[in-house]
Interface confidence: medium
């Protein structure tokens, strides 16, 4: 990359960092320049939890931080376009009785959509403690996308692995039956939502990550962009999480892990999510950053401005 372009990127990042403090609404762009010139950070600062080796199942080339906060939190290495809060039109509600034509949903990469559906199905299978066959997965993918099955399965496996810590394991090398291996050490997060069931609890760390990476507040659109990557859509129930709206704007808020507030002076009104008091009490920005780094197969240095902020918070707290 030409030298001039690098310095422009650095300047832009400085401006963005300053804006973060006041606006907190932009999606951070983690650039090659940032990663190349990130200060070297040692994991000992925060207890050595960060791993510098790529998380299993994450594509290692190119190994750099994802482009959007949502992609970073979901452990997705490709750039996703912003979908907004109404990114998907599901099936008509069972009780709907309109005799009107339905709206067309905004275009979305059908493979991403299918991998989201597959993640939902696999989580359901995990929840009911059942193994899964290739045939069952092919049914979810459908005939039209059969030829893309390996790619869809790869995407779904990555999502399962990095967000929920579940690995799909072939029962035997040539077999078509898979079981789940739970590879997450829960000690880091055992106090977080300890009374909740496994998959719902595992959504919290990435959600806190999306908020942190978006300058400590994330709009509903940014939150939904992240959830869409996991096959969780606004206005459509999920087989594992139930009603996503309730999960994020009610349960997590009621438990004081998130705050949900109107963006001051926004017209038309927009709403944003912030960390709640319990999130600050039970985890830290550094822990969340280490989680995101693990998810993305990198180190907290891949997010230099956020790493600095997390370090400052640790110092303030006297860690």
């Amino acid at each position: 990359m030409p030298r001039g372009q690098k310095s422009k990127l650095r300047a832009r990042e400085k401006r963005r960092k300053a804006r973060d403090e006041t606006r907190g609404l932009n999606v951070p762009q983690v650039t090659e320049a940032e990663e190349e010139e990130a200060p070297c950070c040692s994991s000992s600062v925060s207890g050595g939890a960060a791993s510098s080796s790529p998380a299993a199942g994450i594509p290692q080339e190119p190994q750099r931080a994802p482009t959007t906060a949502a992609a970073a939190a979901a452990g997705v290495s490709s750039t996703k376009s912003k979908k907004g809060a109404k990114s998907h039109q599901g099936e008509k509600n069972a009780s709907s009785s309109q005799a009107s034509t339905s709206t067309k949903s905004p275009s979305e990469d059908p493979l991403t959509r299918k991998s989201g559906s597959l993640v939902q199905f696999l989580l359901y299978k995990y929840k009911i403690k059942k193994s899964v066959t290739k045939g069952e997965m092919l049914k979810i993918v459908g005939k039209r996308f059969r030829e893309h099955f390996p790619e869809i399965l790869k995407k779904a496996s990555e999502g399962l692995s990095v967000v929920f810590g579940l690995e799909l394991n072939k029962v035997n090398p040539n077999g078509h039956t898979y079981t789940f291996i739970d590879k997450v050490d829960l000690t880091d997060e055992e106090s977080l939502l300890s009374s909740w069931d496994f998959p719902r609890r595992k959504l919290l760390m990435p959600l806190l990550g999306v908020i942190f990476l978006n300058g400590n507040s994330a709009t509903e659109e940014e939150i939904w962009e992240f959830l869409n990557m996991l096959g969780v859509y606004d206005g459509e129930e999920h087989s594992v999480f139930g009603e996503p709206w309730k999960l994020i704007t009610k349960d997590l808020v009621q438990e004081k892990y998130l705050e949900y507030k109107q963006v001051p002076s926004s017209d038309p009104p927009r709403f944003q999510f912030l960390w709640g008091p319990r999130a600050y009490a039970e985890t830290s920005k550094m822990k969340v950053l280490e989680f995101l780094a693990k998810v993305n197969g990198t180190t907290p240095c891949a997010f230099p401005t956020h790493y600095e902020e997390a370090l400052k918070d640790e110092e303030k707290a006297g860690v």
């Epitope: 206005g235 139930g242 009603e243 996503p244 709206w245 009610k250 949900y260 507030k261 109107q262």
Partner: antibody, heavy 113, light 112 residues
């Protein structure tokens, strides 16, 4: 997926009745279930909700004391009604809220001597 | 309890026309407002939630707007099938410490 109300019918003034809302095709655990009623030719009136994730219950001010909402199994929620009067005559709906609503067809409760 | 005041109680419009229904909350409810359509003998059916988000399968000629205490439902390019009663509903919003869930009085839409 569906919800169905049962237990409606004719009841004497000052009598009691328990309505049941049964979910098919899903469990109630992650949802609110609410009871709403509609008197003949009138508008919708909220009675109570239960958050099945934690068992918290919420009531309209006018319903407190006479109506009790409770989760009786992973697929059923009941509404107990006491000291009924003619003004309670209505179709009673149970509904799953909010952004993914599902309503039952309703059950008619007639309070009359 | 929060009180939802819906106006008008009844409105008549021609096919292809537009109707506007207003709903006022007795206190601020943020964007925690839904609009429902109900036809005789049927349960209500969701049109809009979170004040302006279209429910699945609802055409873009249906529009919700507003926040705080003032909300509006606008249906343009009216069709005969739009003849029904419309209700606004405030629902529990996490930015509030108290639970609320209340309906407006309803607006009957007659399509000529």
């Amino acid at each position: 997926q569906s919800l169905e109300e049962s237990g409606g019918g004719l009841v004497q003034p000052e009598g009691s009745l328990t309505l049941t809302c049964t979910a098919s095709g899903f469990t109630l655990n992650n949802y609110y279930i609410c009871w709403v009623r509609q008197a003949p030719g009138k508008g919708l009136e909220w009675i109570a909700c239960i958050d099945n994730a934690n068992g918290r219950t919420y009531y309209a001010n006018w319903a407190k004391g006479r109506f009790t909402i409770s989760k009786t199994s992973s697929t059923t929620v009941t509404l107990q009604m006491t000291s009924l009067t003619a003004a309670d005559t209505a179709t009673y709906f149970c509904a799953r809220s909010l952004a993914t609503p599902l309503w039952g067809p309703g059950t008619l409760v007639t309070v009359s001597s | 309890d929060i009180v939802m005041t819906q106006t008008p109680a009844s409105v008549e419009a021609a096919v292809g026309g537009t109707v506007t229904i207003k709903c006022q909350a007795s206190e601020s409810i943020g964007n925690a407002l839904a609009w429902y359509q109900q036809k005789p003998g049927q349960p209500p059916s969701l049109l809009i939630y979170r004040a302006s988000t279209l429910a699945s399968g609802i055409p873009s000629r249906v529009k919700g707007s507003g926040s705080g205490t003032q909300f509006t439902l606008t249906i343009s390019d009216l069709e005969c099938a739009d003849a029904a009663t419309y209700y606004c509903q405030s629902y529990d919003d996490s930015s509030s410490s108290s639970f609320f869930y209340a309906f407006g009085g309803g607006t009957e839409v007659v399509v000529k």
